[in-house]
């Protein structure tokens, strides 16, 4: 029987900066029940203070609600783990809200197959942001990435889109039903779930061209 | 621990290239962004670029892109970065540094040297 | 790119004496939300850089409390109260609130 190996906290995330959860690894348990604390204090402050829920986030994590959060401030946490035998604390780690937002997925996938008449045929997308994103304020910045394939291939064709919410591929298997997806992150965040699929049959006069694609 | 261990110093031919090595170790390597800062001898520091090692996803300061290439191998917790096109003034040391959930770095690499010479 | 603009180059303190270091940026470094991400790190002899202070006044863990930073907008300032012989290197401010990150050129930290 042995005091507890040390803990890792490992991940922090935001769906939308105005919320946060951080996850920690437990170390080796020594052979004994273990208990976790999180604590942490916010830059500028040496008062001390407890996870405020250690129910939301499941297990082995932290949450911090709208009026425990912040994006003026770093906070700085650590993990203790305690047995009968003793105790031990995580590094402490740095965490600055807006560097671990990873937002929902974007909404409102639309496709359609576009066919101009004095121009080659193209299949044109455009989304929407995640709702719970204030992108009115400058500073969020989204990043988008497309991702499709036929139905029944394995391999997906991805495509960067910048900050673009619309987009147009030019080369296309006609005949075939593609599924489509987008997600999003932040510059500096992490990339969003993708969405959920979008089907679209290519007409079998689509014309290949020679092409790739291109932003709108 | 945290450490980041880098490659050996090299010694490279103008119009080559060279890749810096930069292991990590006494973390979650996923976790964090990776940077690469380097100083020129006898200069100030000046950052080539980041990585984030959980998607491979990178940023470049405009003077180093199409010459710089960061890379990881998650496998191995390590980073890399290749800088292409190689000229005198390339001669610098040049550092891994890793940052938390922040952008300033909070841990560097022992640094590697670089000389670029005919 | 902004310009970080060190003075003064080089400073020879005493022992015991109090040093202080500015650091000017070409734009306001105030991030559009609402950080500053000023920070200064200590390069000491044949070492690596070490972080000293975070977001213009943030002391990293383990820095000893004579070092102190301040400033606001464009204007900053790093502050050791009492100089002792282990603060000797080469400091650097650096910006990362706008891509690509920059430092200043450095000011050079001798003892008398």
């Known amino acids: 029987q042995l005091p507890p190996g040390k803990p890792e906290i490992f991940k922090c995330r935001s769906p939308n900066k105005e919320t946060f959860t951080c996850w920690w690894r437990p170390g080796t348990d020594g052979g004994l029940p273990t208990n976790y604390s999180l604590t942490y204090h916010r830059e500028g402050e040496t008062l001390m203070h407890e996870c405020p829920d250690y129910i939301t986030g499941g297990p082995n994590s932290c949450h911090f609600g709208k009026q425990y959060t912040s994006m003026w401030r770093t906070y700085v946490m650590m993990v203790n783990a305690t047995n009968q035998m003793g105790s031990s604390f995580s590094d402490e780690l740095y965490v600055d809200v807006t560097y671990i937002v990873q937002p929902d997925p974007p909404l409102e996938l639309t496709v359609e197959v576009k066919q101009p008449e004095d121009r080659k045929p193209y299949l044109w997308m455009k989304w929407s942001p995640p709702t719970l994103i204030d992108l009115k304020t400058g500073w969020f910045t989204l990043l988008y990435e497309i991702r499709l394939k036929p139905e029944k291939a394995a391999e997906w064709e991805t495509h960067f889109a910048g900050q673009q919410t619309e987009f147009k591929i030019l080369s296309l298997h006609p005949g075939q039903k593609y599924l489509v997806q987008v997600r999003c992150k932040p510059d500096h965040g992490y990339w969003s779930a993708w969405s959920p699929a979008t089907f679209i049959q290519i007409p079998s006069d689509f014309i290949m061209n020679d092409h790739h694609h291109h932003h709108h | 621990e945290v450490q980041l261990v880098q490659s050996g110093a090299e010694v490279k031919k103008p119009g080559s290239s060279v890749k810096v090595s930069c292991k990590a170790s006494g973390y979650t390597f996923t976790s964090y962004w990776i940077h690469w800062v380097r100083q020129a001898p006898g200069q100030g520091l000046e950052w080539i670029g980041e990585?984030?090692?959980?998607?491979?996803?990178?940023n470049y300061n405009q003077k180093f892109k199409g010459r710089a290439t960061l890379t990881v191998d998650k496998s191995s917790s390590t980073a890399y970065m290749e800088l292409s096109s190689l000229r005198s003034e390339d001669t610098a040391v040049y550092y891994c540094?890793?940052?938390?959930?922040?952008?300033?770095?909070?841990?560097w690499g022992q640094g590697t040297l670089v000389t670029v010479s005919s | 790119d902004i310009v970080m603009t060190q003075t003064p180059l080089s400073l020879s303190v005493t022992p015991g004496q109090p040093a202080s270091i500015s650091c000017r940026s070409s734009?306001?470094?105030?991030?559009?939300?609402?950080?500053?991400?000023l920070h200064w790190y200590l390069q000491k002899p044949g070492q690596s850089p070490q972080l000293l202070i975070y977001k213009v006044s943030n002391r990293f863990s383990g820095v000893p409390d004579r070092f102190s930073g301040s400033g606001s907008g464009t204007d900053f300032t790093l502050k050791i109260s009492r100089v002792e012989a282990e603060d000797v290197g080469v400091y650097y401010c650096s910006q990362s609130t706008h891509v690509p990150f920059t430092f200043g050129g450095g000011t050079k930290v001798e003892i008398k």
């Open positions: 990585i984030d090692p959980s998607d491979s996803y990178t």
């Open positions: 734009q306001s470094l105030v991030h559009s939300n609402g950080n500053t991400y």
């Open positions: 540094a890793r940052s938390f959930f922040t952008n300033w770095f909070a841990y």
